[in-house]
């Protein structure tokens, strides 16, 4: 895949993921009422990061915002913060990546500047995706904990009042926003990784690295640690064979002999 294509695709994937993160953050269905015990409920509850809603059989839907900050669970605040951080980093990442795109010419910006910007945006997208994935996972964990706690309460509390009056406890399960968030976070992360990969291809070899000749086994072997230029005849799957100790072993051989650096 060419550098431009990889960079462009990374940008598009990140953009889709970022849009998904915004959608998930705004969605009201982070947790939805568990209908296992009552699949034909006339009142359906669901909650988001910012408000809780009730939808009745009549079609009437009422949503109430969480107008307090202090009264909210710390975990919910943390999830909100993570999602907002993810969005902010995503916005910055998009702005940076627009200028970094190889297909867009801005003034006399050289490839090395574009490479740095591509790497920066890639890292921003990766962090943004991670923030979203962590945020959604923390919320999901909170739901699972509460679900089992309320299930335990439900079965332990049935004996009270001689079993005459039952209190139906509302349990919540995963809402659509969690799945949107996980997928969106994953896409943003993948897009960011693609941007970072594209950065390697954008790096001009001769400006960053000098070709050095090593005398090895009577041969002159040019060793270039940098990535390949798109203009060279090498395919993207061609491996760099580093020559160690006068050509005694290649990088492939090294993998079968663990060193102290293999276990960090």
């Amino acid at each position: 895949m060419s550098v431009t294509a990889c960079q462009g695709l990374g940008f598009v994937v990140s953009l889709i993921g970022f849009a998904g993160i915004i959608a998930a953050t705004c969605m009201d269905q982070w947790s939805t009422q568990d209908l296992y015990n009552n699949p034909v409920t006339a009142v359906f509850n669901y909650q988001g990061l910012w408000r809780s809603c009730v939808r009745e059989s009549s079609g009437f839907t009422e949503c109430r915002g969480y107008f307090t900050l202090l009264g909210l669970p710390a975990m919910l605040q943390a999830v909100r913060a993570l999602m907002i951080v993810g969005i902010v980093l995503g916005v910055i990442g998009i702005l940076v990546s627009i200028f970094a795109l190889k297909c867009i010419r801005i003034g006399s910006m050289d490839d090395s500047a574009k490479a740095k910007m591509t790497l920066t945006s890639g890292i921003l997208f990766i962090i943004s995706g991670i923030c979203a994935i962590i945020g959604v996972s923390v919320f999901a964990n909170m739901l699972v904990t509460n679900f089992w706690m309320s299930t335990a309460n439900m079965y332990s509390g049935m004996g009270g009042m001689g079993g005459m009056v039952q209190t139906v406890q509302t349990r919540y399960t995963f809402g659509a926003a969690l799945f949107v968030g996980w997928v969106a976070g994953g896409l943003t992360l993948i897009g960011g990784v693609m941007m970072c990969i594209a950065c390697r291809g954008l790096t001009p070899d001769d400006s960053n690295f000098k070709a050095v000749s090593y005398h090895a086994s009577g041969q002159n072997v040019a060793y270039r640690p940098g990535g390949f230029k798109a203009s060279t005849g090498f395919g993207s799957n061609t491996r760099n064979k580093k020559i160690y100790d006068g050509g005694a072993r290649t990088e492939d051989d090294e993998q079968s002999h663990p060193t102290k650096y293999d276990y960090v």
């Epitope: 006339a42 669901y46 009745e56 059989s57 079609g59 209190t167 139906v168």
Partner: antibody, heavy 118, light 113 residues
Framework: DVKLVESGGGLVKPGGSLKLSCAAS????????MSWVRQTPEKRLEWVAT????????YYPDSVKGRFTISRDNAKNTLYLQMSSLKSEDTAMYYC???????????WGQGTSVTVSS | DILMTQSPSSLTVTAGEKVTMTCKSS????????????LTWYQQKPGQPPKLLIY???SRESGVPDRFTGSGSGTDFTLTISSVQAEDLAVYYC?????????FGAGTKLELK
């Protein structure tokens, strides 16, 4: 002015079928969940069926499940109740109702009488 | 199914008197999501269909006189008529609107002395 007018009631033998209709006017029919409620000769009220706004969900009590079918024709602003395998305990005055917030029934038709007798 | 129990089954009152009737449900009708009780009160006069009075246990339907007041939460509910008028003579029904199947109480009949 909201109006619900039921029709289709009458005398039917046990095991027979009957289709009730409810013509709605004075409101946007497509925007409301509709229900059928019956009142027995002993004056007890019994909920019979509910159809959600889009018509995609229908609900019934166990006493009529599999025998009664609620449906709606939004183009005709009409609610229906298809009743089959009728029993003597289905004898009642059948009302067409509109659901509003709180799942409350704010408008009721005048009712149509169904008598199941041999 | 949620069982609705109304008491008393009938009440004999004089005009201007304050009347209270109760409705008990076998399960809580309080929805935790919006802290609302899904209980409705209806009034049925002879030869007429029921008429909505109170929804969400305490919200008065528009056009209903303010002498009608609904109260209660969870499983115990009350309908109060502060000063009974001749036109209030009817049967009053409570209904569970919280979960299917919707169920009605047997009714409380209000009669004049």
């Amino acid at each position: 002015d909201v109006k619900l007018v039921e029709s289709g009631g009458g005398l039917v033998k046990p095991g027979g079928s009957l289709k009730l209709s409810c013509a709605a006017s004075g409101f946007t029919f497509t925007s409301y969940t509709m229900s059928w409620v019956r009142q027995t000769p002993e004056k007890r009220l019994e909920w019979v069926a509910t159809i959600i706004i889009g018509g995609s969900y229908t609900y019934y009590p166990d006493s009529v499940k599999g025998r009664f079918t609620i449906s709606r024709d939004n183009a005709k602003n009409t609610l229906y109740l298809q009743m089959s395998s009728l029993k003597s305990e289905d004898t009642a005055m059948y009302y067409c109702t509109r659901l509003v917030k709180g799942n409350a029934m704010d408008y009721w038709g005048q009712g149509t009488s169904v008598t199941v007798s041999s | 199914d949620i069982l609705m129990t109304q008491s008393p089954s009938s009440l004999t009152v004089t005009a201007g008197e304050k009347v209270t009737m109760t409705c008990k449900s076998s399960q809580s009708l309080l929805n935790s999501g919006n802290q609302k009780n899904y209980l409705t009160w209806y009034q049925q006069k002879p030869g007429q269909p029921p008429k909505l009075l109170i929804y969400w246990a305490s919200s008065r339907e528009s056009g209903v006189p303010d002498r009608f007041t609904g109260s209660g939460s969870g499983t115990d509910f009350t309908l109060t008529i502060s000063s009974v008028q001749a036109e209030d003579l009817a049967v009053y029904y409570c209904q569970n609107d919280y979960s299917y199947p919707f169920t009605f109480g047997a009714g409380t009949k209000l009669e004049l002395k």
